[in-house]
Amino acid sequence: KIDACKRGDVTVKPSHVILLGSTVNITCSLKPRQGCFHYSRRNKLILYKFDRRINFHHGHSLNSQVTGLPLGTTLFVCKLACINSDEIQICGAEIFVGVAPEQPQNLSCIQKGEQGTVACTWERGRDTHLYTEYTLQLSGPKNLTWQKQCKDIYCDYLDFGINLTPESPESNFTAKVTAVNSLGSSSSLPSTFTFLDIVRPLPPWDIRIKFQKASVSRCTLYWRDEGLVLLNRLRYRPSNSRLWNMVNVTKAKGRHDLLDLKPFTEYEFQISSKLHLYKGSWSDWSESLRAQTPEEEPTGMLDVWYMKRHIDYSRQQISLFWKNLSVSEARGKILHYQVTLQELTGGKAMTQNITGHTSWTTVIPRTGNWAVAVSAANSKGSSLPTRINIMNLCEAGLLAPRQVSANSEGMDNILVTWQPPRKDPSAVQEYVVEWRELHPGGDTQVPLNWLRSRPYNVSALISENIKSYICYEIRVYALSGDQGGCSSILGNSKHKAPLSGPHINAITEEKGSILISWNSIPVQEQMGCLLHYRIYWKERDSNSQPQLCEIPYRVSQNSHPINSLQPRVTYVLWMTALTAAGESSHGNEREFCLQGKAN
């Protein structure tokens, strides 16, 4: 704390508030009889800037010129030093450094809506650190003037509170802003404008959409606008898109027909308005209207595939599969699929509606020529039916694709390659690549996947529903008219050694040899496509290397004979399984002693 100036005075020139970069004169003078006792010559007056000595003088007064003060406040204190005593505080002064206002820049005025009021904004420029008074002046026709002040350090906006009317839309108005503080003043360049230049319409409101006869092709957007609006901008997009479609319309009078909307799609619509072709500014965008367009009957055709399974001498099972239409093809919510099965010679037809899934299985006689047609239906109609003649897809051996291979291609992809069939390759109309998880029981409930490939292609990358460490049965069909040929292969996208070996469940003796039977390794432990089984055996209690027999893996095989065992010798047997990545651990061990006669 600095005491009131009882012992002396400090005077400041030109003021306690000065311009950045200017000089201030500080004078400290003692009052009569306030100096050091006895020897007034010993008076030593010291001037401190904060806690640092900047000047001193022997006598009754001290004069100091100070420059280079920073923005803000600097404290000066004058003290008296006498011999053999502490310094005594005389008086203090705070000097505040600020800046004169810079010229306000980019003055712009706007009236929001025809009934709004004129408000202006500007850029203040550098902070003055001082109370700065801004005066905004607007002059119009017939010597009319309006003035508004704001007394705030950070003022850059003022509303006149007056409304410009469209009676004389070409009349000129001029705005100017002047900034004044204790260190100076500055005025902006004048900004001249007309009613049409500064009125920014309110955004359109009450937006509605109508579809005549519930059709997407007869769609009208309606809205309400202020009275003087001449131009509108419409923008619309599907709700899941980031890109807008833009339309500019003149004299729309609150309605516009949209012709390019997609059916059964949620759209977002917004509208903006403007009073004049090249004057003024666009309104803000209106609030969004979200609306779903009506359905239209499906377009495109279903991709249909099938599988035949022999049941007995007179019956066969047909399983039909189809893929969902794309959203753009379905053009609505698919309510059901219509499947028609027909015997072509007898003309008998059976139609069934399938809901909730994309497959259908039925049993038909093995005789006759059968065809199916499948279509998708929404509330507006059905797609064109996809027709397929049921044939034996692998009957034509000469149409079978050759040298089929399946190789892992990155994560969860398999590249299938083949060579065209020996029979005239140009006869091939298309290839179909089919794949499904390999289940030893040949389970027909396992989902089927397929893709179609053009006749000149000899490879296909399969990635849909492909999992790591799972073996897939892959078939390549070559189709030509009412004939088909096929080749198959096993493939996986990623593999490692199986987690366990086969479980031997029985060993039986047959005419001096043995038959080993085993249980398949659970699918989830196979870790890819099995290539071989190995059967190991050695004499019990022997330290010799075991003998082994390697059997190529076949899906249906679960037993194998061995005829190299000696009679009346007890053997230990076990099995392993191999993938391309390596061999499994041992399965269970079984002991067996052949009872037959020695050779």
Epitope: C5, V10, I26, F96, I153
Partner: nanobody, 119 residues
Framework: QVQLQESGGGLVQAGGSLVLSCAAS????????MSWYRQAPGKQRELVAE???????TYADSVEGRFTISRDNAKNIVDLQMNSLKPEDTAVYYC?????????????WGRGTQVTVSS
């Protein structure tokens, strides 16, 4: 912000004296500077005298030695003792307070009091 109320103006003969007083009310904390300004008809407003919260003063050259400014920090009052008045001292006298507002100064003004010096 601070409200300022001036008093003490009036008509006085040349050579006479007057004391103007200004009282600050409202949020009067941290008043850095209290000042007197004057504005004669048709002229710019000019600084007469100012006093900081530490007691340092500034005077316009035209009033130095004749006018004395003093301040009571406790009561937020500033007085201007005007002696040896001259006709050219005739003006409306305004009180001003500069207050800290963050790292800036915010000013408040009184409505003014008329001083007329007749010859």
């Amino acid at each position: 912000q601070v409200q300022l109320q001036e008093s003490g103006g009036g008509l006085v003969q040349a050579g006479g004296s007057l004391v103007l007083s200004c009282a600050a009310s409202g949020s009067a904390a941290l008043i850095f500077l209290m000042s007197w300004y004057r504005q004669a008809p048709g002229k710019q407003r000019e600084l007469v005298a100012e006093v900081s919260r530490y007691g340092s003063t500034t005077y316009a050259d035209s009033v130095e030695g004749r006018f004395t400014i003093s301040r009571d920090n406790a009561k937020n009052i500033v007085d201007l003792q005007m002696n040896s008045l001259k006709p050219e001292d005739t003006a409306v006298y305004y009180c001003k307070a500069d207050q800290y507002y963050g790292d800036s100064l915010r000013s408040s003004w009184g409505r003014g009091t008329q001083v007329t010096v007749s010859s």
